[in-house]
């Protein structure tokens, strides 16, 4: 990119109409047949949706103005925010003594922007300020990115919570989970 | 020795369904994810998705979403794929493979292949 | 989708030749590029992972290397049992993906 990417410290973010449709149904799961059918989803945050195919890496539309300081995009920005996992949970369980140890079952992928565009917006200030143009980084595609155990912590941090995945060996923290742990996590698109 | 042994041949009409079996044996089924390809008459290979044995959970390509739904059964140690709304161009063999790791370079790989299950779409 | 693309589609051969075959991905996987071996009615094999790491039980011929989008795989001195289509396939970014296939016939 030959620009610089432009920081926004406030946006107001105004969610696109049908983003707030109704939970889903309680899922149920059989522990010897376990079965993935169409419809298993997680929770997402800010909203969730009955769409089927949501149990995945999903770009959700925002749209929000552009603020620098006093100075506001005279007109919203729609962009993607990736959301959603990438498959299911690929960590096993492995009981050593009382403990319960973890360790993966399958390379660690997240949600993350694959592609950005450039947008040029006008920013009008108060107090009759002259108005100002700027160029803003908005995300234009997602994709189900392969982390390594080699990421460190600053990498992860762009990839959002959870980003981590356990090493072999190591006992980690066990996710925040509900009750029915699986439920949530029976099926993915890619 | 680790095997994955799936069923046999099948014939459908477009529209109908095919659930093609794969039993796993020589190692701890549940320690794995299963993942499916398939391959097309004289085309490459084409990977259609995933199971977690352990918690059902699955993740698919999209490009089959809402068509196909994968399934395991840890008591006999055998993972299910089932295809529905069958068309012509879902003729092909369809291949279960473990997915194998190296702790050194961390990184992960297709050791274990089934033998195939040919499946042909025809009117 | 990543697309990989290998090259050439196919290509003849004689016993004791050197083979070179590429595999191209549409953007940076890294290192995380698999090669299997897939003969007539049968599954395919894993021959290398991780670009250049030899599977247990794999001749030295083979051979791999690269990183980013650009790869290769490298017979040193074909065999007859070598006579097979070859995959390359990614691990980097769902889905994974294969590439088309190279034919490896006998001149």
């Known amino acids: 990119q030959g620009w610089q990417a432009f920081k926004n410290d406030a946006t107001e973010i105004i969610p696109e109409l049908g983003e707030y449709p109704e939970p889903p149904p309680e899922l149920e799961n059989n522990k010897t047949m376990n079965r993935a059918e169409n419809g298993g989803r997680p929770p997402h945050h800010p909203f969730e949706t009955k769409d089927v195919s949501e149990y995945s890496c999903r770009e959700l539309h925002f749209t929000r103005y552009v603020t620098d300081g006093q100075c506001r995009s005279a007109k919203p920005v729609t962009e993607l925010v990736c959301s959603g996992q990438c498959g299911p949970a690929r960590l096993l369980p492995n009981a050593i003594g009382r403990g319960k140890w973890w360790r993966p079952s399958g390379p660690d992928f997240r949600c993350i922007p694959d592609r950005y565009r450039a947008q040029r917006v006008q920013l009008l200030c108060p107090g009759g300020a002259a108005p100002r143009a700027r160029k803003v980084r908005l995300v234009a595609s997602c994709k189900c990115k392969r982390l390594t155990r080699f990421h460190n912590q600053s990498e992860l941090k762009d990839f959002g919570p959870e980003a981590a995945r356990p090493q072999k060996g190591r006992k980690p923290r066990p996710r925040a989970r509900g009750a029915k742990a699986n439920q949530a996590e029976l099926e993915n698109a890619y | 020795e680790v095997q994955l042994v799936q069923s046999g041949a099948e014939v459908k009409k477009p529209g109908a369904s095919v659930k093609v079996s794969c039993k796993a044996s020589?190692?701890?089924?549940?320690?794995?994810?299963m993942h499916w390809v398939r391959q097309a008459p004289g085309q490459g290979l084409e990977w259609m998705g995933e199971?977690?044995?352990?918690?059902?959970?699955?993740g698919y390509n999209q490009k089959f979403k809402g068509r196909v739904t994968m399934t395991t059964d840890t008591s006999t140690s055998t993972a299910y794929m089932e295809l529905r709304s069958l068309r012509s161009d879902d003729t092909a063999v369809y291949y279960c493979?473990?997915?194998?790791?190296?702790?050194?370079?961390?990184?992960?790989?297709?050791?274990?292949w089934g033998q195939g299950t040919t499946v042909t779409v025809s009117s | 989708d990543i697309q990989m693309t290998q090259s050439p589609s196919s290509l003849s051969a004689s016993v004791g030749d050197r083979v070179t075959i590429t595999c191209r991905a549409s953007?940076?996987?890294?290192?995380?590029l698999n090669w299997y071996q897939q003969k007539p009615g049968k599954a395919p094999k894993l021959l290398i992972y991780h670009t250049s790491r030899l599977l247990s039980g794999v001749p030295s011929r083979f051979s791999g290397s690269g990183s980013g989008t650009d790869f290769t795989l490298t017979i040193s001195s074909l065999q007859p049992e070598d006579f097979a289509t070859y995959y390359c396939q990614q691990g980097d970014t769902l889905p994974y993906t294969f590439g088309g296939g190279t034919k490896v016939e006998i001149k």
């Open positions: 493979a473990r997915l194998g790791y190296d702790d050194i370079y961390d990184d992960w790989y297709f050791d274990v």
């Open positions: 020589g190692y701890t089924f549940t320690d794995y994810n």
């Open positions: 953007q940076d996987i890294s290192n995380y």
């Open positions: 199971i977690n044995p352990n918690s059902g959970g699955a």
